[in-house]
Amino acid sequence: YDFTNCDFEKIKAAYLSTISKDLITYMSGTKSTEFNNTVSCSNRPHCLTEIQSLTFNPTAGCASLAKEMFAMKTKAALAIWCPGYSETQINATQAMKKRRAAKVTTNKCLEQVSQLQGLWRRFNRPLLKQQ
């Protein structure tokens, strides 16, 4: 999916008002210095591509993020403010229902959510030069 035509300001507002808080809740009890940010993004569409991938694609050691509250809210924001995104999710939703992975917070998941926090922060500061 190409995130170029999303309403970035409305997605940013949703992140600042609610998604960011859910990410913090998920990471509670973890030191902010515990994980290094290894995933980066260069502009807003690229950031959303990386955010979608890390949030919804199961990875080795972390298969369950899609059921978390921040993930549900991310999915809603993309469906509402990214033209045509919802139709790409029809089949994905069916597949996710079949998988039904249990919610398990592993260290790998915490690391992944830490990366997500970094990607979202970068999404909110699109004019900053890449380090």
Epitope: A14, S17, T18, M72, A77, A79, I80, W81
Partner: antibody, heavy 120, light 107 residues
């Protein structure tokens, strides 16, 4: 089963405001956005806007910007649509309709409609 | 804003006949089109979602097709209860919009 029950008909004077309610039951309220669609007598359907409880935010049709406010009360699973500075051409049936925001993505259940008449 | 244009405005047919309703979008919207039926004094009822996907409880004489800019709702054999107004809607991008409607009336 899923039900959306709207408040009763209203008669208002030009310049006044109206607040229509829509009580939902039979599903998880926060899994769906609540959209508002109106239909003037003998006319087609016009999307007014939506409130998304999951994100606690709204998005409105520019045609109504500044005149409309959509809210929800999640404790009672009720959505509200307030339209201000009413004009005679706001006379219409106002519908609420739910739409999934993490699945479904379509207006699959509608309220029965609320007739708002604006007349001096 | 995406404009949906429905044709014809009115379709006069007899029970048992086939009805073909058209909906054209002002720009490509992939398959983000849904079809609704509305009878006098009633709320719209969802018939088809995402251009061609059937809805539970809707008779299989209703079918949809199309993608991009051109979409079609087909009623294979009209029943007396099918005479109503039909609307297409796009949810590709905000603001969501509806076509102006096609009235299917008894000939």
């Amino acid at each position: 089963q899923v039900q959306l029950v709207q408040s009763g008909a209203e008669v208002k004077k030009p310049g006044a405001s109206v607040k229509v309610s829509c009580k939902a039951s039979g599903y998880i309220f926060t899994d769906y956005a609540m959209h508002w669609v109106r239909q003037a007598p003998g006319q087609g359907l016009e999307w007014m806007g939506t409130f998304i409880p999951l994100l606690d935010t709204s998005d409105y049709n520019q045609n109504f910007k500044g005149r409309v406010t959509m809210t929800t009360d999640t404790s009672t699973s009720t959505a509200y649509m307030e339209l201000r500075s009413l004009r005679s051409d706001d006379t219409a049936v106002y519908y609420c309709a739910r739409m999934g925001v993490t699945h479904s993505y379509v207006m699959d259940a509608w309220g029965q409609g609320t007739l708002v008449t604006v007349s001096s | 804003e995406i404009v949906l244009t429905q044709s014809p405005g009115t379709l006069s047919l007899s029970p048992g006949e086939r009805a073909t309703l058209s909906c054209r979008a002002s720009q490509p919207i992939s398959i983000s089109v849904h079809w609704y039926q509305q009878k006098p004094g009633q709320a719209p009822r969802l018939l088809i979602k995402f251009a061609s996907q059937s809805i539970s409880g809707i008779p299989d004489r209703f079918s949809g097709s199309g993608s991009g800019t051109d979409f079609t709702l087909t009623i294979s054999r009209l029943e007396p209860e099918d005479f109503a107004v039909y609307y297409c809607q796009q949810t590709f991008s905000l603001p969501y919009t509806f076509g102006q409607g096609t009235k299917v009336e008894i000939k």
